[in-house]
Structure formats: C-alpha cells, structure tokens
C-alpha cells in the first residue's frame, strides 16, 4: 500500500461559500470517501471554514498507510467582499467596455495571493480591471471573470454588455 501522504500528494480542493453563514466549505477532490482526522469531513467536505484562516486537515483512507496527508486549507476571503463593477464611461459606451473587480471591504488574506482573470470572447486578461476599446457599436459582448486565491477559484461572475448606438455620422 502507498502512504496516504503519497496517494493524496496532489489532492485539489474547491471552495464553496455560504452567503448566510459567511463560511466556506472545502470540497476535497478525491474518488473515495476519506477520513479527516480531527476535522470531521462529511462526504469529502470540510465545513464551517472562516475566511482567511488556515485550517489543517489530516487525510487518511484504508487504501493507504501512515503517514497521513496533511493538507493546509488556505481559506479565501468572503465572496461578498468583491463586486464586479461596470466602469464604462457613458460618453464612450458605444465602442468601449470597462469592467473592474471592486474590493468593497478589507480582509486579512494576503492580497498578493489573489489573482483575477477576465475572458471576453477569445481575449484573456489577468487583471483586476479591464478596458476594451475600439469595439463595434450596438454589439453584445460576454465577459466571464473569476478570482483565485492561491490558484483556487473561489468566485466568478459574468457580464453581458451591449455597446451603445454609434453617434450619427460615424
């Protein structure tokens, strides 16, 4: 049998946010139902994780031996602290789209571990704020965006923006 440390060396995690409790659930991406040591996990999920607080989970299973895999859960900031904002200027709305993630509330997570991604059509931007210029007037554009904390996606949003009519004579 392999050790659990080896077997689960590359385990990945998804973070799910509960807007009512303002707590996260970490979903462990494994095929079998694992044990989580002191942290109880139900159906491979670790519940009631506080934003920006690290949690340590000891993962074991009867298919592997000691030592267990010690997984450090880097819990992201609360989702409601981020808002996707349309920053397009009215006078340029016929050929321009501006989108930005606003941090409306502080948090204690390291901001340097946060990355932003926008995808508008086939264009990808790793920025917190994007401005697309020289667009066609009266066209619909879809932009998908996500925020990652330590390379784990924890929130996403999409915006469908229709550019305005062009000015007469343009």
């Amino acid at each position: 049998k392999p050790t659990c440390d080896e077997k689960y060396a590359n385990i990945t995690v998804d973070y799910l946010y509960n807007k009512e409790t303002k707590l996260f659930t970490a979903k462990l991406n494994v095929n079998e139902r694992v044990e989580c040591g002191n942290n109880t996990c139900t159906n491979n999920e670790v519940h009631n994780l506080t934003e920006c607080k690290n949690a340590s989970v000891s993962i074991s299973h009867n298919s592997c031996t000691a030592p267990d895999k010690t997984l450090i859960l880097d819990v992201p900031p609360g989702v409601e602290k981020f808002q996707l904002h349309d920053c397009t200027q009215v006078e340029k709305a016929d050929t321009t789209i501006c989108l930005k993630w606003k941090n409306i509330e502080t948090f204690t997570c390291d901001t340097q571990n946060i990355t932003y991604r926008f995808q508008c059509g086939n264009m990808i931007f790793d920025n917190k704020e994007i401005k697309l210029e020289n667009l066609e007037p009266e066209h619909e554009y879809k932009c998908d965006s996500e925020i990652l904390y330590n390379n784990h996606k924890f929130t996403n949003a999409s915006k469908i923006i229709k550019t305005d009519f062009g000015s007469p004579g343009e």
Partner: antibody
Amino acid sequence: EVQLVESGGDLVKPGGSLKLSCAASGFAFSNYDMSWVRQTPEKRLEWVAYISSGGVSTYYPDTVKGRFTISRDNAKNTLYLQMSSLKSEDTAMYYCARRYDVWWYFDVWGAGTTVTVSS
Amino acid sequence: DVLMTQTPLSLPVSLGDQASISCRSSQSIVHSNGNTYLEWYLQKPGQSPKLLIYKVSNRFSGVPDRFSGSGSGTDFTLKISRVEAEDLGVYYCFQGSHVPMYTFGGGTKLEIK
C-alpha cells in the same frame, strides 16, 4: 521583497515640467491602485494623485488638477507622475504608495524623491 | 474638502507614559456604506510614513497592541498605552471616506519630555 522606488526628482524653475517614476517590485502591481503623496518642507502630507489598477480611473485634488497627470505601465511595473506649470508650492518630497482599492489603506510607501521648484 | 485637524501639534511624553492624539474632521467621515475610513500613520525621522491603524480601530499587521484607535463621526483618537523610544516621530490621521478627495491631518510630533 515588496518595494517601491521613486526617481526623477530635481531642481526645476517655476513654470517648468518634470516626470517622476516609481518602480514597483515584489508584488502583482497590476492588481493595486496607486497614489502619489507629497510632503511639504513644513512636513505636511498632501495626497496629489490616484490611479486605479488598470489605469482606467484617475483622481486629483484641485491644487494640481490640470497640471499633474498620473499614469502607469503595468507591463513595466512602473507608476508615473507628469508635472507641468510647476509652482514654488509644489516643492516637496514625493512618495508613491500602494492602496489595494479605494476602500483600503496605504500599506506600502516608497522612500521618496525630492522636487524643488525655485528660480 | 474635508479638513482634518490634529491636536496637539507637539506631544512631549516620558517613556512608559500613555499618549493620546486627537483628530477632528470638518464633516462626518462615515461613508454611506456604514464604514469610516479613518487611518493613522507614523513617520519616524528620515523614513516614509507607515500604516498603524485603518478603519478607526483596526491595527495593521505587525503593529504592537499598545496602539489603539477609537472614535466615530468627526472625532477620533489614537492612544499609545506605554510609549517606547521606537514610537517617537510624527503621527498623521487620514480620511479616505470622501473618495477620491483624500486628506491628511497636519501631524502631531511625539517627543521625549
């Protein structure tokens, strides 16, 4: 190491122009809003310019509006302050400072660069 | 513009004493979102300013717990419970509620009596 290093300060005559630079390192520059803050010889701190992370929004106090222009080059991790029609009251130490968003705080400051406006 | 007035201008203290600095804004700096963006910075001789307190009473990481901030509306206070030699310098309050018209207080110099 997170660092901001200002440069470009000089002695300039009234009415003259000057461009300050601030080189950022050790962090994802394009995710941070940035500001210029100056300190007068009397040690008063004055905020003089603000730019959003992608360079979309810029703000200035009335004292410098129309004379100063803040800009950034995220590919070069550099912040700029173009100053024109300089006055003697613009004499100060100029600091660049990062602010993760408008609702945050200035958590990293550079060491400053000195601008002297005098004939 | 929001005017930030600090008192006193100079504060002579003995090491180990408590120090208190006041900051008053010319209008309320409570933002419509309910938050008050009042910050305190310390500038030691020959250095650039460093953040101590944000949103009235939150200590920035690494700031000793002898520093505390309080207040609401237009009146704010920074207290240092036991002044140490490394605390000497000029303290500035700052308001970030009236975005983007940021303003600093005039500064309070903390010095040895």
